[in-house]
């Protein structure tokens, strides 16, 4: 799978994580920080 950093327009897309662009899948993906989940790392869990 080809990946690259997200475009600058997606700054802030991932609330608590790193945004990765999955080129072959034509979509952005959020790699969440520890303790966060959700498509955009918007949910905190203990």
């Amino acid at each position: 799978v080809s990946i690259t950093k997200c475009n600058s327009d997606m700054n802030g897309y991932c609330l608590h994580g790193q945004c990765i662009y999955l080129v072959d899948m034509s979509q952005n993906y959020c790699r969440c920080e520890v303790g966060y989940t959700g498509v955009r790392c918007e949910h905190f869990y203990l």
Partner: antibody, heavy 116, light 106 residues
């Protein structure tokens, strides 16, 4: 199956406002950005602006600033684009476009006609 | 705002010809360019994103290349069904479409 279903065609008088809706099904708009693009008859595609429904944050093209308002209601999974002070040059097909989780998935378009 | 200058605005070519369309950005767009095909009365159809990544179901005669500010879209062998208007779109910083290229058969 993911879908963006837009409201029906509108005819408006100059100076009036129009509000076009874009209802998502099959996915949660909070996971995406919703863009709005328009196309006047026989003309090219023009990006108008977008909303991040999760945060409620908007970005607009400079030429539309102050005249366009993009909103989202996450409880109904629907985005809206309102354009005010309509003029004949605003006659166009207006599209909502999903981006983020999937690159550029388009609604079917809504024709807005501005005529006196 | 980033400007996208697309050329030519129209072209006429024969079936089987190689067709090339260019888009020049006013600043580096880091390969974040997409190409759309639009036929009359239809919504635009995404052909290519991230400069050269072909979408599923798109014929391999369509291709894209470029970097920095200069990008190219190519139809290696024009087919009658390719008659349409083609648009580039930069999506690095917000979004800007090129002016479009109308492709006709000679």
């Amino acid at each position: 199956q993911d879908q963006l279903v837009q409201s029906g065609a509108e005819v408006k008088k100059p100076g009036a406002s129009v509000k076009v809706s874009c209802k998502a099904s099959g996915f949660n708009i909070k996971d995406t950005y919703i863009q709005w693009v328009r196309q006047a008859p026989g003309q090219g595609l023009e990006w108008m602006g977008r909303i991040d429904p999760l945060r409620g944050r908007t970005k607009y093209r400079e030429k539309f600033e102050g005249r366009v308002t993009i909103t989202a209601d996450t409880s109904t999974n629907t985005a809206y684009m309102e354009l005010s002070s309509l003029r004949s040059e605003d006659t166009a097909v207006y599209y909502c476009v999903r981006s983020g989780t999937l690159f550029d998935f388009w609604g079917q378009g809504t024709l807005v006609t501005v005529s006196s | 705002d980033i400007q996208m200058t697309q050329s030519p605005s129209s072209l006429s070519a024969s079936v089987g010809d190689r067709v090339t369309i260019t888009c020049k950005a006013s600043q580096d767009i880091h390969k974040y360019i997409a190409w759309y095909q639009q036929k009359p009365g239809q919504a635009p159809r995404l052909l290519i994103q991230y400069t050269s990544t072909l979408q599923p179901g798109v014929p391999s005669r369509f291709s894209g290349s470029g970097s920095g500010t200069d990008y190219t879209f190519t139809i290696s062998s024009l087919q009658p069904e390719d008659i349409a208007t083609y648009y580039c779109l930069q999506y690095d910083n917000l979004r800007t479409f090129g002016g479009g290229t109308k492709v006709e058969i000679k």
